[in-house]
């Protein structure tokens, strides 16, 4: 808390400008009107305030808006956003994607902080679902964002948003998350032709059921081993040797290198040795 003191004569701020960097903390508290600060927030970022001075400016805004800042102020917070706590942010009502982008830009290059996580949570909850534009924005700043959501949160992602998802956005997703995303992707890409469909759906196949893998095996897709290794164990086990051979195409030889790893090991163990021998890879069930 900064002690309340009268503003020295002639020091009353008429606008937010560089002269304020020479003000002591108590002078900023006494001489800068909170309403003026709120209307000229866009200027704060251009001025090299110290962290201590930013603390004072935040304190003034907190006093002016005890129930939470309006979006007109939030959009121009800039580096002052880094001073906000998750508790502060929970009071906000952020509806504009531009506001979200502006604040994410401040944190760019850093890992997702608790403040950013709270901001995103407030924004998405306010919108009711993760629409395509929001998802585009979030994954651009944080490629792992999608995989940081719980399966329950992912259920609010509309299939149309799946078009915004890039393969690298799914790198850290676990099987439960892919179980939710796969049906949405299947729906989103349903009108594409065979080869184009496979290119799009490939990253989501960790959530695919057996019947879909069987269907893919009939389409000469030549799935690579990296994708095969990410498939659900329960989806792989019922596949026959012939189906796996068709699914992998020329990549079937890669099974030998993965024979000690799941889910390949689990699958091999449950096949008839005679069937495995038809692959000519020396796989032992």
């Amino acid at each position: 808390e900064v002690e309340k003191t009268a503003c020295p004569s002639g020091k009353k701020a008429r606008e937010i400008d560089e002269s304020l960097i020479f003000y002591k903390k108590w002078e900023l508290e006494a001489c800068v009107d909170a309403a003026l600060l709120a209307t000229q927030m866009d200027r704060v970022n251009a001025i090299p305030f110290t962290y201590e001075q930013l603390d004072v400016l935040k304190h003034k805004l907190d006093e002016l808006y005890p129930q939470g800042y309006p979006e007109s102020v939030i959009q121009h917070l800039g580096y002052l956003f880094l001073k906000m706590s998750p508790e502060d942010i929970r009071k906000w009502n952020v509806t504009s994607l531009e506001t979200l982008k502006a604040l994410l830009e401040v944190n760019k290059g850093h890992e997702m902080s608790p403040q950013v996580a709270t901001l995103i949570d407030r924004f998405v909850k306010g919108r009711g679902q993760l629409d395509k534009d929001t998802l585009d924005t979030l994954t651009a700043f944080y490629p792992g964002y999608l995989c940081s959501l719980s399966p329950e949160e992912l259920s609010s992602v509309p299939p149309s948003s799946i078009w915004a998802v890039r393969p690298q956005d799914l790198d850290t997703c676990d099987p439960r998350q892919l179980d939710v995303l796969y049906p949405k992707a299947r729906l989103a890409f349903q009108n594409m032709n065979g080869s184009e469909y496979f290119v799009k759906i490939q990253s989501f196949l960790g959530g695919a059921p057996t019947e879909d893998l069987k269907a893919l095996s009939q389409q000469n897709v030549s799935m690579d081993l990296a994708t095969f290794m990410k498939l659900r164990t329960d989806a792989v086990l019922p596949l026959t040797v012939a189906e796996v051979q068709k699914l992998l195409g020329p990549h079937v030889e890669g099974l030998k290198a993965e024979e000690r790893h799941r889910p390949v090991r689990d699958w091999i163990l449950r096949q008839r040795q005679d069937d495995l021998d038809t692959l000519g890879l020396g796989l032992q069930g």
Partner: antibody, heavy 119, light 107 residues
């Protein structure tokens, strides 16, 4: 529900063969989704996986013990067994049998049996 | 073989504390990571499988996360019955290795 029970001698002489049996009740050793493992824990130490068997007879052993281990299955008795040859004092441990469910992990364990290697 | 390294090897905590245990694999094991709890004189008990799935009957204060090489077990609010030793285990590779264990003791 499925229960596992280890049985066998609690004392084995050095250089001899340790033999243990695990009886499966409330379920079948021929289950499609399950492997049957042996795991041991020396006094005051961590867990060490010994090996597994599938009802078909397929086995897989810990590389560090492979030359001394044999695991077998008897589907008619609903049992699987462990033989560890040429034992030394370093093989003194609590030996557990466990079900390895393909979707989860070692989800059911026996209560464990202490085997001491001493002359 | 894949090595599993757990840290810390032991920790002291109080009832109500949030406890985090980490497990690192020497190479990527995708999401194939299980967590077990063992109390003195008892067999281990499966808590978490596939890195983040809660085994049936396990309290929701236990959660797991991670993929690739780095994994975490979190107990959101430690209860008296949670004082035990915790082990991670990888079923990805056929060598089925366990971590060295983390003993959670009362502070």
């Amino acid at each position: 529900q499925v229960q596992l029970q280890e049985s066998g001698p609690g004392l084995v002489k050095p250089s001899e063969t340790l033999s243990l049996t695990c009886t499966v009740s409330g379920g079948s050793v021929s289950s499609y989704h399950d492997l049957w493992s042996w795991i041991r824990q020396p006094p005051g130490k961590g867990l060490e996986w010994i090996g597994y068997i599938y009802y078909s007879g397929s086995t897989n052993y810990n590389p560090s013990l492979k030359s001394r281990v044999t695991i077998s299955v008897d589907t008619s008795k609903n049992q699987f067994s462990l033989k560890l040859s040429s034992v030394t004092a370093a093989d003194t441990a609590v030996y557990y049998c466990a079900r390895d469910n393909v979707f989860t992990g070692f989800d059911i364990w026996g209560q464990g049996t202490m085997v001491t290697v001493s002359s | 073989d894949i090595q599993m390294t757990q840290s810390p090897s032991s920790l002291s905590a109080s009832v109500g504390d949030r406890v985090t245990i980490t497990c690192r694999a020497s190479q990527s094991i995708s999401s194939y990571l299980n967590w077990y709890q063992q109390k003195p004189g008892k067999a281990p008990k499966l808590l978490i499988y596939a890195a983040s799935s809660l085994q049936s009957g396990v309290p929701s204060r236990f959660s797991g996360s991670g993929s690739g090489t780095d994994f975490t077990l979190t107990i959101s609010s430690l209860q008296p019955e949670d004082f035990a030793t915790y082990y991670c285990q990888q079923p990805y590779d056929a060598s089925y290795t366990f971590g060295g264990g983390t003993k959670v003791e009362i502070k």
